[in-house]
């Protein structure tokens, strides 16, 4: 029974003249990957990665297809003709064959730059908002703490003056709300069936590609 699933990078876009990484990952199976084939939209071969023989790059693509990272493929010097579907075929033992699909859209440089012109101010504005929110939260927390510590100080000094010997237990303050964290997530369950260098390369690749939330603030609330 085939229990595995192929996870792919899905629909991706890249700039003409640039490069892109095509990546598939087989998960939810203990099957051994014996070979991965990479094919283009017209089902013409791009490359093969065999577990025992290494990489075979289709000769016409040798100049602009780089093997890896891991079992993936890097397409370089992209042209508009590279737009279309790409397929990864995993030959596994004992499961058999799994197939994944990626759609690549190659954008004209001007289109990419145009979208970037809109995206950069938008990202900037979002980042500014996050920074402002973080600062506001920190200010509120600091002020709240100051008020609290002033109250506690006055209570303590009152108690000391009474000299009753009783101690008041002050609950420890929770970690400051609004502390900004940078999340870096590598996909879970990676390299279940892979061993050796490819697996390490794959980990590195996902760590590089991991989503980094730009100064996103995580708010912790303490209940009961």
């Amino acid at each position: 029974m085939m229990t595995g699933t192929i996870e792919t990078t899905g629909n991706i876009s890249a700039k003409k003249g640039g490069s892109v990484i095509l990546q598939c990952h087989l998960s939810s199976t203990m099957a051994q990957v014996t070979q991965v084939n990479w094919e283009q939209h017209d089902h013409s071969l791009l490359a093969i990665r065999n577990a025992e023989l290494g990489w075979h790059i289709y000769p016409a693509f040798k100049d602009r297809v780089a093997p890896g990272p891991g079992l993936g493929l890097t397409l370089q010097s992209l042209t508009m003709n590279d737009t279309g579907e790409y397929f990864c075929t995993y030959h596994t033992y004992p499961d058999g064959t799994y197939r994944g699909r990626i759609f690549l859209e190659v954008l004209e440089s001007s289109v990419a730059e145009h979208s970037a012109r809109f995206q950069i101010p938008l990202l900037g504005a979002m980042a500014m908002m996050l920074v402002v929110i973080c600062i506001a939260v920190i200010v509120v927390v600091v002020l709240a703490r100051k008020k609290k510590s002033l109250r506690i100080h006055s209570v303590e000094s009152g108690l000391q003056r009474k000299s009753t010997g009783q101690e008041e237990q002050i609950p420890s303050a929770p970690s400051p709300p609004g502390s900004c964290v940078q999340a870096e997530a590598a996909p879970a369950g990676l390299c279940g069936e892979q061993q050796g260098d490819d697996c390490a390369e794959l980990h590195d690749y996902f760590n590089v590609l991991s989503y980094r939330s730009l100064g996103s603030c995580s708010f912790f609330t303490e209940t009961g």
């Epitope: 577990a51 290494g54 000769p59 016409a60």
Partner: antibody, heavy 119, light 107 residues
Framework: QVQLVQSGAEVKKPGASVKVSCKAS????????MYWVRQAPGQGLEWIAF????????TYNQRFRGKATLTVDTSISTAYMELSRLRSDDTAVYYC????????????WGQGTLVTVSS | DIQMTQSPSSLSASVGDRVTITCRAS??????LSWYQQKPGKAPKLLIY???SLPSGVPSRFSGSGSGTDFTLTISSLQPEDFATYYC?????????FGQGTKVEIK
């Protein structure tokens, strides 16, 4: 058209080494791997190893590790195979062959080089 | 290692005959199989790759079929120049291995 021209026949003594060359023409040398196969007299075909002319990386049949060493000189589109510590059972015709477009098969073959090992 | 077993090891046929040679792999090799023709004193020549694909220049009377472990080379109408030895080869793992050969002789 694609052509592979191998060096001439060799007679060697046991324990010696021999270097067979394979000159390629009619295609872009670095786009293909070069394979080496041997055929003992009256016997079948046996794959030795291949070398990626682009990267210079080689993949060997375990049986021939330490026996065969593959190299390329991309400036003159030539592949080489050196056989060391020759024994009489290394007597064979050695073929170079250009790899196929779609995988690890042999698309175009050289004419072969007979290596005779005799004391 | 993946073992390749050809049958028959030799056969006699006449010009115009339909000839079938089989090749069996010791484990599944999907469609990663090629066929070669070798004439005495000559280098082998590629006939079929990926089980059924013909390189340019190979006559259409040659055809290949099969996948997994069982493969067939068929010569639909044997010609005088087809008398030779035929080898199968898998290209799915290390080491690449060939069948022991099938010699096609004139009856």
């Amino acid at each position: 058209q694609v052509q592979l021209v191998q060096s001439g026949a060799e007679v060697k003594k046991p324990g010696a080494s021999v270097k067979v060359s394979c000159k390629a023409s009619g295609y872009t040398f670095t786009r293909y791997s070069m394979y080496w196969v041997r055929q003992a007299p009256g016997q079948g075909l046996e794959w030795i190893a291949f070398i990626d002319a682009y990267s210079g990386g080689s993949t060997y049949n375990q049986r021939f590790r330490g026996k065969a060493t593959l190299t390329v000189d991309t400036s003159i589109s030539t592949a080489y195979m050196e056989l060391s510590r020759l024994r009489s059972d290394d007597t064979a015709v050695y073929y170079c062959a250009r790899g196929g477009d779609y995988g690890w098969y042999l698309g175009v073959w050289g004419q072969g080089t007979l290596v005779t090992v005799s004391s | 290692d993946i073992q390749m077993t050809q049958s028959p090891s030799s056969l006699s046929a006449s010009v115009g005959d339909r000839v079938t040679i089989t090749c069996r792999a010791s484990q599944s090799i999907y469609s990663y199989l090629s066929w070669y023709q070798q004439k005495p004193g000559k280098a082998p020549k590629l006939l079929i790759y990926n089980a059924k694909s013909l390189p340019s220049g190979v006559p259409s009377r040659f055809s290949g079929s099969g996948s997994g472990t069982d493969f067939t080379l068929t010569i639909s109408s044997l010609q005088p120049e087809d008398f030779a030895t035929y080898y199968c080869q898998h290209h799915y793992g290390n080491p690449l291995t060939f069948g022991q050969g099938t010699k096609v002789e004139i009856k």
